[in-house]
Structure formats: structure tokens, C-alpha cells
Amino acid sequence: IWELKKDVYVVELDWYPDAPGEMVVLTCDTPEEDGITWTLDQSSEVLGSGKTLTIQVKEFGDAGQYTCHKGGEVLSHSLLLLHKKEDGIWSTDILKDQKEPKNKTFLRCEAKNYSGRFTCWWLTTISTDLTFSVKSSRGSSDPQGVTCGAATLSAERVRGDNKEYEYSVECQEDSACPAAEESLPIEVMVDAVHKLKYENYTSSFFIRDIIKPDPPKNLQLKPLKNSRQVEVSWEYPDTWSTPHSYFSLTFCVQVQGKSKREKKDRVFTDKTSATVICRKNASISVRAQDRYYSSSWSEWASVPCS
Amino acid sequence: RNLPVATPDPGMFPCLHHSQNLLRAVSNMLQKARQTLEFYPCTSEEIDHEDITKDKTSTVEACLPLELTKNESCLNSRETSFITNGSCLASRKTSFMMALCLSSIYEDLKMYQVEFKTMNAKLLMDPKRQIFLDQNMLAVIDELMQALNFNSETVPQKSSLEEPDFYKTKIKLCILLHAFRIRAVTIDRVMSYLNAS
């Protein structure tokens, strides 16, 4: 058993049929010595008396809020949560496996630049009685500070018969140099509590590997005289690290109709302009990627050809 | 190796082309190592990230763009020097183009070159003959060093009398290649910045 936060405790259980469970001793936080009784949740049934209560925790029915009282007055609470371990593996029932970039990916993180700010998100089908808490650091043995905000519900989607909820959190490394060469990864730890079930999820990454620039901005077309070709120009996104001559981007320019199966014109360039062939009912799209370290491409920025 | 046929953009900052080749060569070599050593811990997640130049050179700090010198997090051990030297500097005069930066890059390359050559000598003794260093990568390191045109004491190639542990050598190769790729990215960014200055 360990303390998650004040008066909240996590009991780690090997989860299999007829498992013996864990013996837990609860102590009432009071100077009083006698006349103390214990109850669980909203029940008035007295579970025991005395300053300490010993219980055998085997299942979710044994978890919950234990309260010690004296003469009708509440002295203190202890909330017990369960963390299940099945076949030596901690349960991952609360969050959905996003399967990208690989299986067992529950947390996904992205950074728009090298400033040390990043966003992580996760998915669940659970809509109520759900809380998250996020901690992060650079390295684990001698951790350096990363400050994370509160996790918030950022999107709701309908997937078939199910509703899916996306939560996200923003974190910022306390003293980040955009030009630094990372040797210790960022560690992100998410504590998830659904009703009386506790789970924790972790992700470890270098900022350089989760870079995904914002799309290029200010796309403009200039038709070339006596030609089907147009010159398309754009600018670096405002959120990208500066100076741009040090943090350079490379771009992919594509002309395509509405369907992905349609024919297209595609060219890669390090410049902020390119010449392409425009077709009726097609769009010109441009996306960006770090020129020197190939992490993710940005989303497309698009303008119609006509 | 074949002699180059055409020299692109003759006015270009001389080292930019070499640094681009360097990043390409080390990235290819790392990819090859990952594929060939698929049953060894050779991915970024599996290896320990070591920097053989740590406390010996200060490339990131010495080559920091002027715009980032206002960022206190970037100034841990920054020593500024505005002396210009080395053939890559051509005749451009900007305070960023400091000898310290380019000589630090040169020292990095020299250290990695020695490590790679020592390692290759060991890998050539491996009866499995599983992986060797790409000669192109070694040649590109050499070309960039020549373009930087700094003179410094020759570092003797390490020779070891004991029987090499090939498993450890291959893991060390992965560690070295990952670190060198990260340094090559920094070098490329620096050269691109210098070229634009």
C-alpha cells in the first residue's frame, strides 16, 4: 500500500481467482484513543472499533472511503483504491490503446517547436467518475523540472456505438534551451482513477522525436504567364522555433483533387515557394517537417487551385 | 571514390555542403546498423545516450545563434569568442562566426573519427563479419575536417591488446552512431545559420 495523495491510498493486488489479497491496517488520524468506530462509504454498518482497523483487501467491494468516527463526529477519512496486476502486468482498463506508433501506446505527445513545451493526450470511453493527474520530469534518476497543467477534456467523438473522450495536458520544461542536444528523455506519468480503480500510464521521449510543426501559413498563388504552372508561396508557422536559418524546415507541396486516389503533382523543397501544375477542382497543399531531424510532418495547409 | 563532376553553388558557404553530406551519411549508417543489428539493443529507446565529447568540446554553446544568447537556459557554459579563423569563414564578418564554434566542431569530428576507426578495426576482426563502418561516412568526416582547415594535435588511434568483446563493440557502435547523428544535426543547423548570416 502507498499514499497517492493526502488520505488517498493505493492497494496493489495480484488479481486472480481466490487470490489472498492484501492485509491493510488503517490508522485514524486523531489524538483520541477510545470510542472510535469505522464505517465504509455511505454505509452505517460498523466495521470495527479502535484507533486502527485491519482489513483484508481482495476485491473492489473492499475498497472505498473508510471513515473513523467518535460519537457521531467524523475524525478522518482514508480512501482506498485498487491497482490490479494480472499475470504480472498492471491493468490498463481506463485508457484506450491508440496503437500509434506502436501497440500499447496509451499516451501520445507532440511538440510544435523546441521550446520545451509539449502536449500529451489520451483516449477513454469512460464519461464519469474519472480523474487524472499528470507529473513530468527530464530524466528519472536525477529529475529536472517539467511543469504540467491540469488535464482537461479536449474532444468528444462518436465511434460506432461508443462515445470516445479525449483528454489532454500541456507541459513545459522549466529551463529548456531550444538548441540543446537531449541526452535524457522527458518522462510523463499519468495517474488515472475511475471510481475505485487506480492505474498509471507512462511515456518516455525526447522532444526532438515528438516534433510536429504547425502547418505553413499565408499560402499564396501566383499564376505564371503563358503557362499552366502556378507559383505557390508560404511562410514558416508562427509557432516554429527561431531563428529559421538554424531551425530550418523542409516542405512538401502537393496538388490533388478531392479524392486521395486522384492523380497528383508533388514536389519537395527547402524553399518557401515552388512551381506546380494546377488543375481545375484541385487544391494546392503544403506541409512542413524539420529539415535535419525527420520527425512528423505537419498537417496540410491548403488553398483551392481556381 | 569518384571525383565530383559538378560543384553546385560555388558561392555557397563551403562547409554547408559537407555538413549535409555528413548528416546523410551518419543517418544512413545508423539505419543500416539498426537493420543489421536488429537483435541488439540499437534503437533510440533501448540505448544509453552517451556523448563522447561531453566536457571536452562545447559545440552547442559555442555555436549558439545570436538570437538564443538571450535565453538563460542556453548559457550554462557559454564562452564567447569573436575571433574568426578557418577556411569555412571565407570573408564574411559576423560576430557569430567565431573560431571557437568551428574549432569545436572540428574537435568533435576528430574525436568521433578516432572512435569510429578504432571500432572498425575491432569489427573487422569479428568472425561473423556482421557489420562494418561505411567508408563513405569516414570519408565525409574527413572532407568536412579538411574544409574546416583547423590544425590540432593528432589524436593517436586507441589500440587494445585484449580480445575484443564483439557484442559490446556493436552496442557501443549503436550508442556512438546515435550520438553522432544528434551532433551532425547540430552541425548542419550551425552551417545553415552561418550560410544565411
Epitope: R228, K263, D265, V267, F268, D270, I277 | P8
Partner: antibody
């Protein structure tokens, strides 16, 4: 299976014109760009131009501008390349080729040998 | 026009050995570079798109690398069927241009 079948070999006199055809099968004809590339005996590949069969848009290499005409007939899924004012150095194998991507080629025809000789 | 220069023009290789062909552009073309193989009396066949993207159906021993002005086609271990002429082609701008070709011959 996408296939491009070209017309047979031709022998032409200098100053005359030649029209080579290329019939496409497999896939929708207008879903692809069609290119013409030639190869003189023992020489490398030389791009001549492309056509978008959907709208008839064309682009020619400056070297052939004014001498080459590429057309397409959607009803028969056939593209044509006509080269006029032939000279002996136009002796080559002419390939039609196609791709959904405009700037490179993934499927080639078998080639048509055009010999220009007096 | 962008001039593509291949080297060497002839490359004698022992079967089973690796081979590397170089292609250089007269100006920077990013990764807008494609590789083709042509056997005598046959039409060309696409091998690599955009400098390093492999094409389905092409053996994994063929790989491409490079960006900017310098590109390489590598055959990790030459098979008897790989003896042919190889061409690079730039798609950075029109007109599309090819290298002169590199003939890989049996040593």
C-alpha cells in the same frame, strides 16, 4: 494489371512526321498522366512531354517545343505523340509511360522504334 | 534545365558484392530524385521514388539515399538479374531530366 501497348516500328524520311500511338488498359485512362520519353540507340533517356487526358493539358520539353504534339482520345484510351520535321538524330525508341504522380513514371510501354533515314 | 550527372558510367561488380551508383544534380533538388533500371531490349522499370522511398515489388537490396545535389543508389548484394543500366531522374522542375545512365557489368 496496368498495360500500355504501343504501335509498331516506323521508318520515315527526313522532313516528314511520325505519329506513335499508345493504348492503355487496366485502370481509368483519365486517372493518369501520360508521358513520352525517347531513347536514341545506345543512349540515355530523354523526356519529351506529358498530357493530362482528363483535360488535354500538355507540357513539352523546350527542346521539342513546336515540333511535338501529344494528344489523347479518352473514348479509346489511347494517347498519341506526333513528331514533325524529322531528322536522322530523331532515330530512337519512343516510350509512352504513365503514373498518377505527374513528375515520375511507374509504368512504361514496350517502346516503338522510329528510324529516320533517307 | 537541371543537368543530372551519373558516375561511374560503367561499374564492373562481382555477383554477391555491393554496388553504389552516384547521381549529382547541377542545382539543389531536395529529394525530387527517382531511380530506374533498364535491361537490354526492355523498357525501364521504376526502383526508387523521391530519393529513398522503396517501391512495392522491388527487392529490398535496392535502396536510395541523398538530398540536395548528391544521391546514391545502393544494391546491397548484386544478383545476376541486377546487371543492367541504371538511370536517375529529377522531378524538381520541368523539363524532367535523366542522368546518362550507369551500366553495371559482371566483373
Amino acid at each position: 494489371q496496368v498495360q500500355l501497348v504501343q504501335s509498331g516500328a516506323e521508318v520515315k524520311k527526313p522532313g516528314s512526321s511520325v505519329k506513335v500511338s499508345c493504348k492503355a488498359s487496366g485502370g481509368t485512362f483519365s486517372d493518369y498522366y501520360l508521358h513520352w520519353v525517347r531513347q536514341a540507340p545506345g543512349q540515355g533517356l530523354e523526356w519529351m512531354g506529358w498530357i493530362d487526358p482528363e483535360n488535354g493539358d500538355t507540357e513539352y520539353a523546350p527542346k521539342f517545343q513546336g515540333r511535338v504534339t501529344i494528344t489523347a482520345d479518352e473514348s479509346t484510351s489511347t494517347a498519341y505523340m506526333e513528331l514533325s520535321s524529322l531528322r536522322s538524330e530523331d532515330t530512337a525508341v519512343y516510350y509512352c509511360a504513365r503514373n498518377k504522380e505527374l513528375r515520375y513514371i511507374d509504368v512504361w510501354g514496350q517502346g516503338t522504334l522510329v528510324t529516320v533515314s533517307s | 534545365d537541371i543537368v543530372m550527372t551519373q558516375s561511374p558510367l560503367s561499374l564492373p561488380v562481382t555477383p554477391g558484392e555491393p554496388a553504389s551508383i552516384s547521381c549529382r544534380a547541377s542545382q539543389s533538388i531536395s529529394i525530387n530524385l527517382h531511380w530506374y533500371q533498364q535491361k537490354p531490349g526492355q523498357q525501364p522499370r521504376q526502383l526508387i521514388a523521391f530519393a529513398s522511398q522503396s517501391i512495392s515489388g522491388v527487392p529490398s537490396r535496392f535502396s536510395g539515399s541523398g538530398s540536395g545535389t548528391d544521391f546514391t543508389l545502393t544494391i546491397s548484394s548484386l544478383q545476376p538479374e541486377d546487371f543492367a543500366t541504371y538511370y536517375c531522374q529529377q522531378s524538381n522542375s520541368f523539363p524532367l531530366t535523366f542522368g546518362q545512365g550507369t551500366k553495371v557489368e559482371i566483373k
